[in-house]
Amino acid sequence: GITIPRNPGCPNSEDKNFPRTVMVNLNIHNRNTNTNPKRSSDYYNRSTSPWNLHRNEDPERYPSVIWEAKCRHLGCINADGNVDYHMNSVPIQQEILVLRREPPHCPNSFRLEKILVSVGCTCVTPIVHHVA
Amino acid sequence: GITIPRNPGCPNSEDKNFPRTVMVNLNIHNRNTNTNPKRSSDYYNRSTSPWNLHRNEDPERYPSVIWEAKCRHLGCINADGNVDYHMNSVPIQQEILVLRREPPHCPNSFRLEKILVSVGCTCVTPIVHHVA
């Protein structure tokens, strides 16, 4: 990895061992320079592998609300608007970091957690399993 | 929102105002219960809107490495394996939380940051703009 010189103005770290506890400022800085208002907003409906978004709420997690995509069909939508089962709709998943309150119900103590979320769906050619 | 009683065993919070600084344990807990080994691994190649993954590295960020999807074509791959420009490949984007070292180069002090990443691509029907 890249070694970076430590800033002498850093706060003291009480625990140098891993697992380590760090200080995190929750005042979120939004670096999204992409100002395109449409973004993925209507793709869920226009996609050949359309999906619905489901609200997943957990007050013990930060962010407490995450939207999960579920593909509408196993097949993909063809040019006639019908489902074509020679193609497969599949979820595009991503591992993301969230903060989990630990101990539970604590407002200012968290643990990093990795969760798998489904962001949308894409249409793929099926894997053909050849029987010997 | 949902109000949860505070756990009396919580660490003290020095700053009760927002923006607030919280303690975060960086020993990541992996909650991925989905054991499907395939996941999205080969979808980028099999998709009708295929994409390439680009490594985005930033040592001042946690996680330092993020993979960004870039759609290979403007159109989508048809049944003959050719690009069909009557359909559009578009990136599926998601806002994710990362930790940004603040002050810079500090190993144990961070600020939450929201960034927009492209996770994969999907094939959509184009929006037709009618000229008056």
């Epitope: 619905n52 196993l74 489902v83 099926p126 | -």
Partner: antibody
Framework: QVQLQESGPGLVKPSETLSLTCTVS????????VSWIRQPPGKGLEWIGI???????DYNSAFKSRVTISVDTSKNQFSLKLSSVTAADTAVYYC??????????????????WGQGTLVTVSS | DIVMTQSPLSLPVTPGEPASISCKSS????????????LAWYLQKPGQSPQLLIY???TRQSGVPDRFSGSGSGTDFTLKISRVEAEDVGVYYC?????????FGQGTKVEIK
């Protein structure tokens, strides 16, 4: 507990529109989808269509031109409208909740809770 | 549309004895991406609405007794009751949820001998 209750007129004249309401309780509308299924007297089950959690719909092509499913979330009610009915539309009509499975990334078309059903007779 | 064919259409049973119902699909219900078979079984007791027993071929719905089991893959599926009880009488339906429209079998009537 989870409950679904169909209501509407038991008798509809041919060529008119059949209108039914399904009132639900005990589950979150934003998570679950609801299907309508019918069962002609002494016969099997026939899926009519579904309304997803976002208000989008998918219909059995056999009914597509004359069916509309909608939702009024403020009242926890789903509705089914079937136009231009004939005697062949005489059936018990059910609304049913589609199963929601966390960590499963497809909409589900198994129905895990059903209303008691309402008989609609098409006759002049 | 996918045709679901059940057999037998009528099944007289003796309490305590096993019973088996077959369901055949006109196309494979196995989804290659997750290796799941999109088949469910329902029981409609006399005068009641259907209730889900089994989904994804073999996963029992919560609260369903373990005397009910499902098996099969592709186009051929079976529902077994290891020891029939009096409360198991009614019409059993298989349903495929792979292809739209989602279709049901014609039903198998299970009754006590």
């Amino acid at each position: 507990q989870v409950q679904l209750q169909e209501s509407g007129p038991g008798l509809v004249k041919p060529s008119e529109t059949l209108s039914l309401t399904c009132t639900v309780s005990g589950f979150s509308l934003p998570s679950h989808s609801v299907s309508w299924i019918r069962q002609p007297p002494g016969k099997g089950l026939e899926w009519i269509g579904i309304i997803w959690n976002n208000g989008g719909t998918d219909y059995n092509s056999a009914f597509k031109s004359r069916v509309t499913i909608s939702v009024d979330t403020s009242k926890n009610q789903f509705s089914l409208k079937l136009s231009s009915v004939t005697a062949a539309d005489t059936a018990v009509y059910y609304c049913a909740r589609n199963m929601y499975i966390t960590d499963y990334y497809y909409e589900n078309y198994f129905m895990d809770a059903w209303g008691q059903g309402t008989l609609v007779t098409v006759s002049s | 549309d996918i045709v679901m064919t059940q057999s037998p259409l009528s099944l007289p049973v003796t309490p305590g004895e096993p019973a088996s119902i077959s369901c055949k699909s006109s196309q494979s219900l196995l989804f290659s991406e997750n290796q799941k078979n999109y088949l469910a079984w329902y029981l409609q007791k006399p005068g009641q609405s259907p209730q889900l027993l089994i989904y994804w071929t073999s996963t029992r719905q919560s609260g369903v007794p373990d005397r009910f089991s499902g098996s099969g893959s592709g186009t051929d599926f079976t529902l077994k009751i290891s020891r029939v009880e009096a409360e198991d009488v009614g019409v059993y339906y298989c349903q495929q949820s792979y292809y739209t429209p989602y279709t049901f079998g014609q039903g198998t009537k299970v009754e006590i001998k």
